[in-house]
């Protein structure tokens, strides 16, 4: 959470001389309350915008817009404090609009905007606009707050931002997972244009449960330049456990820009459909059990194995 670096922050508009200042988030009117204070903002609108920094990076920013109520309290409005709180870290950033001239009623409702709060992908923010001076203790609140969830890097608009690109958002592995038989799973995906290794993480689950019944990790060495953008396929050997049939395959890249914190892509294979009608019970019982060629369970130390190769 920070302010966009290179922009001259302006809030003046026809009929109002105004300057934007950094704020400690504790306006002086908290400490020295005034008798007459303005009413709260009428509406706050927040949306996501993408701006470029002076270093040419594209960053997500919050576009905050609000309007004033059309009451006489605008005569006592000296400015506004904008506060953004990042929920998960409790980091807060504030700026103050300082009105250098008195507001007057005019034919249009007064409207203010600010688009300089740089935010992080997949984070939640509380945006508060506080009219100044702030009310006396027990006075009517003159602020309005709204929450805003910044989309994650999967979102089309976010994908092209620098923080998302750094975490590998432009790579689309287009994963396909296919069950070859009860013991083998084939995974195909597109390699990115970087000589970096990948990891395939296989987690298997019983039909209706979220506790894994099998886990396997497979390492894919860094491809050569001629293999960039090619399809790579891997055959993973499954643990032959009855009912351990739902498989989640996650591909973790290790790009130089994000190392072990790159965006992962996953695909899931569901358990085969159970027949709607139960098998009919025979009206006779066999005198012996047919011999089974293989056991349903393997030894615990029989780990899944795999092999892979790249397609050209």
């Amino acid at each position: 959470l920070r302010l966009l670096d290179h922009r001259a922050l302006v809030c003046s508009q026809p009929g109002l001389n105004c300057t934007v200042k950094n704020s400690t988030c504790l306006d002086d009117s908290w400490i020295h309350p005034r008798n007459l204070t303005p009413s709260s903002p009428k509406n706050i609108y927040i949306n996501l915008s993408v701006s470029s920094t002076q270093h040419g990076e594209l960053v997500p920013v919050l576009h905050v817009e609000w309007t004033l109520q059309t009451d006489a309290s605008i005569l006592y409005l000296e400015g506004a404090e904008l506060s953004v709180l990042q929920l998960n870290t409790n980091e807060r950033l504030c700026v103050r609009f300082e009105f250098l001239s008195k507001l007057r009623h005019h034919h249009r409702r007064w409207r203010f905007t600010f688009s300089h709060f740089v935010v992080d992908p997949d984070q939640e923010y509380e945006v508060t606009v506080h009219h100044l001076p702030k009310p006396i203790p027990d006075g009517d609140p003159n602020h309005q707050s709204k929450n805003f969830l910044v989309p994650d890097c999967e979102h089309a608009r976010m994908k092209v931002t620098t923080p998302c690109m750094s975490s590998g958002s432009l790579w689309d592995p287009n994963i396909t997972v296919e069950t070859l038989d009860t013991q083998h799973l084939r995974v195909d995906f597109t390699l990115w244009n970087e000589s970096t290794h990948y990891q395939i993480l296989l987690t298997s689950f019983p039909h209706m449960e979220n506790h894994s019944c099998f886990e396997h990790m497979h390492h894919i060495p860094a491809p050569r330049p001629e293999e960039f953008h090619q399809r790579s396929n891997v055959t993973l050997t499954l643990r032959n456990l009855k009912g351990c049939c739902r498989h989640q395959v996650q591909i973790q890249p290790f790009f130089s820009s994000c190392l072990n914190d790159c965006l992962r892509h996953s695909a899931t294979v569901s358990c085969p459909e159970m027949p709607d009608t139960p098998e009919p019970i025979p009206d006779y019982m066999p005198l012996w059990e047919p011999r089974s060629g293989s056991s349903d369970y393997k030894d615990d130390d029989d780990k899944g194995s795999s092999h892979h190769h790249h397609h050209h």
């Epitope: 709180l85 409790n90 997949d122 509380e126 707050s145 992962r264």
Partner: antibody, heavy 118, light 107 residues
Framework: EVQLVESGGGSVQPGGSLRLSCAAS????????MNWVRQAPGKGLEWVSI????????HYADSVKGRFTISRDNAKNSLYLQMNSLRDEDTAVYYC???????????WGQGTTVTVSS | DIQMTQSPSSLSASVGDRVTITCRAS??????LAWYQQKPGKFPELLIY???TLQSGVPSRFSGSGSGTDFTLTISSLQPEDVATYYC?????????FGPGTKVDIK
Amino acid sequence: EVQLVESGGGSVQPGGSLRLSCAASGFTFSSYSMNWVRQAPGKGLEWVSIISSRSSIIHYADSVKGRFTISRDNAKNSLYLQMNSLRDEDTAVYYCARPKVGGGMDVWGQGTTVTVSS
Amino acid sequence: DIQMTQSPSSLSASVGDRVTITCRASQGISNYLAWYQQKPGKFPELLIYAASTLQSGVPSRFSGSGSGTDFTLTISSLQPEDVATYYCQKYNRAPFTFGPGTKVDIK
């Protein structure tokens, strides 16, 4: 001194209700999001709920969703947890906790005990 | 929701030993991870936040590392007062889930 003091715990029958309070002092309460965390006897920590500084963002753990309500009164420097439709598994010590700027929770209350039993 | 796992669930070590506890997230959480120490009958205390930043007042024998899905809490030289249960907690997005805990005692 920065302090959080919980109150309102007690014994209640399954299906009953309780309201927990947390009184904050020594810091600007209205600048912080606040959390409730609980710990069942002999078990680990379970995050319960968070409320942002101006109450515009609220989240709950799945285990309490629809039954518990978090709220705050910044003028009174107080945080609340209204617990309805209580179950045996809600028996725990309930802590209110203040997040640290940068992450984690650096200020905790001493906890208040809730016992749900018939 | 992202699951948090910790290993081992308990450990015994001698005074002066180097102790390592690992915490794993089922999906990447960047460096949004905190570690807590809880002594019997007490409330938890923050040791480390942002995966590797030491909370003020915490002895320097505690350190944290990791990013993405795999994290480590290390006590470089175990002291008698370090007997406690240690929890990791992810805070990238709500729910801010805790790990199941690792109980540390002295041999």
